[in-house]
């Protein structure tokens, strides 16, 4: 799986899970969210050359005829496959809020 | 939606469904399919602006923080989102054997 | 160059199953299809079945379609057959090959894999 | 299942001698398409067989031009004009118009 455990321990061009922290306030311009005040959201990035990871039957014939086209711009794209929540706290006036936002951190990629 | 009715029609930078013709014997080396000589596979390309067609949570995050961080590496990018399958013939001996192939087509993209 | 590696060599239980590998390398994995067959000393050959890494297609041999079983791995170029149900007379040597297409002439051969089925 | 007889089982030739083996079909290898699916191989001993002939009459790529293969229907043979040391070892005729695919039981070639 191109997760954590695999690409960063690994120096890898292709397609693989990046670490990317996110703050807030200084990347987002979110300055209502109390905790955390930012989180390790991760990206995916690379190439996607032949039979890298790929996620789909399109994906797999893309590859190839990538391959087999290499002047073609059509080719297959790094993207996030896994992605888990973030649990956030913030305040309604007085009140605080606990809330847990989906699809928020990267876990894993695939070639698509 | 991001598919042949919006695209096909317009001419656009942005994420968007682009044709593709795939001759299998020519584009992939597959030499043993009978029927069709090739299909419309179609791809998906283009940029990923801030909030365009954004697909999870974490995309919108990422094409914010793009937004805010220009010289970053990391942006959302362009996939397919819904694929359709293709029916195939072909001769195993003398015997024809039509398959159903699936996720062979894009009808449409997300930003992911 | 063309080159399909298998282990030399697997010993088994009666009543076990088995799962072999086929490595491929030096071409495109998934533009040919990968073809099994079983041998016998004194037996000949046997064709088990085809299967196809580029869309995952298979063909089988009737007489094996309950006792082989074809997979790919693509991110890996591997194609694995399982046996099950082993018994005296799956003891043969199993070789994967390659081909353009169902009807083809196989091109390439592994070495195969010697199953010895005992206990 | 198509049934293919080879003959002989053995044959003993003395190099630079022209050797001819036969193999016989069951039923008509001509497919609808008009290819006729009948290859040879040879396999020497501790080794995976080779390709010599497809389709009937096709020399396979570095194949010598001492080999040469014939028939019709369902009577086929393939001749070396000039045994060479290096030619030693078993032959198989194998034919993929019928499923399941079949293999003739070999003959072995060797030195008188």
């Known amino acids: 799986a191109l997760d954590a455990a695999y690409c960063f321990r690994n120096v890898q061009d292709n397609c693989c899970l990046r670490p990317l922290y996110i703050d807030f306030k200084r990347d987002l311009g979110w300055k209502w969210i109390h905790e955390p005040k930012g989180y390790n959201a991760n990206f995916c990035a690379g190439a996607c050359p032949y039979l890298w990871s790929s996620d789909t039957q399109h994906s797999r014939v893309l590859s190839l005829y990538n391959t087999i086209n290499p002047e073609a711009s059509a080719s297959p794209c790094c993207v996030s496959q896994d992605l888990e929540p973030l649990t956030i706290l913030y305040y309604i006036g007085k009140t605080p809020k606990i809330e847990q936002l989906s699809n928020m951190i990267v876990k894993s990629c695939k070639c698509s | 939606a991001l598919d042949a009715a919006y695209c096909f029609r317009n001419v656009q930078d942005n994420c968007c469904l682009r044709p593709l013709y795939i001759d299998f014997k020519r584009d992939l080396g597959w030499k043993w399919i009978h029927e069709p000589k090739g299909y419309n596979a179609n791809f998906c390309a283009g940029a990923c602006p801030y909030l365009w067609s954004s697909d999870t949570q974490h995309s919108r995050v990422l094409s914010l923080y793009n937004t805010i961080n220009p010289e970053a590496s990391a942006s959302p990018c362009c996939v397919s989102q819904d694929l359709e399958p293709l029916t195939i013939l072909y001769y195993i001996g003398k015997t024809p054997k039509i398959e159903q192939l699936s996720n062979m087509i894009v009808k449409s993209c997300k930003c992911s | 160059q063309v080159q399909l590696q298998q282990p030399g060599a697997e010993l088994v239980k009666p009543g076990a199953s088995v799962k072999m590998s086929c490595k491929a390398s030096g071409y495109i994995f998934t533009s040919y299809w990968i073809t099994w067959v079983k041998q016998r000393p004194g037996q000949g050959l046997e064709w088990i079945g085809d299967?196809?890494?580029?869309?995952?297609?298979?063909n089988y041999n009737e007489k094996f379609k309950t006792k082989a079983s074809l997979t790919v791995d693509t991110s890996s170029s591997t194609a694995n057959m399982q046996l099950s149900s082993l018994t005296s007379e799956d003891s043969a040597v199993y070789s994967c090959a390659r081909k353009l297409g169902p009807n083809y002439a196989v091109d390439y051969w592994g070495q195969g894999t010697s199953v010895t089925v005992s206990s | 299942d198509v049934v293919m007889t080879q003959t002989p089982l053995s044959l003993p030739v003395s190099l630079g001698d022209q050797a001819s083996i036969s193999c016989r079909s069951s039923?008509?290898?001509?497919?609808?398409?008009?290819?006729?699916?009948l290859h040879w191989y040879l396999q020497k001993p501790g080794q995976s067989p080779k390709l010599l002939i497809y389709k009937l009459s096709n020399r396979f790529s570095g194949v010598p031009d001492r080999f040469s293969g014939s028939g019709s229907g369902t009577d086929f043979t393939l001749k070396i004009s000039r045994v060479e040391a290096e030619d030693l070892g078993v032959y198989f005729c194998s034919q993929s118009t019928h499923v399941p695919f079949t293999f003739g039981s070999g003959t072995k070639l060797e030195i008188k």
């Open positions: 299967i196809f890494p580029g869309t995952g297609s298979t």
């Open positions: 039923q008509s290898l001509i497919h609808s398409h008009g290819n006729t699916y």
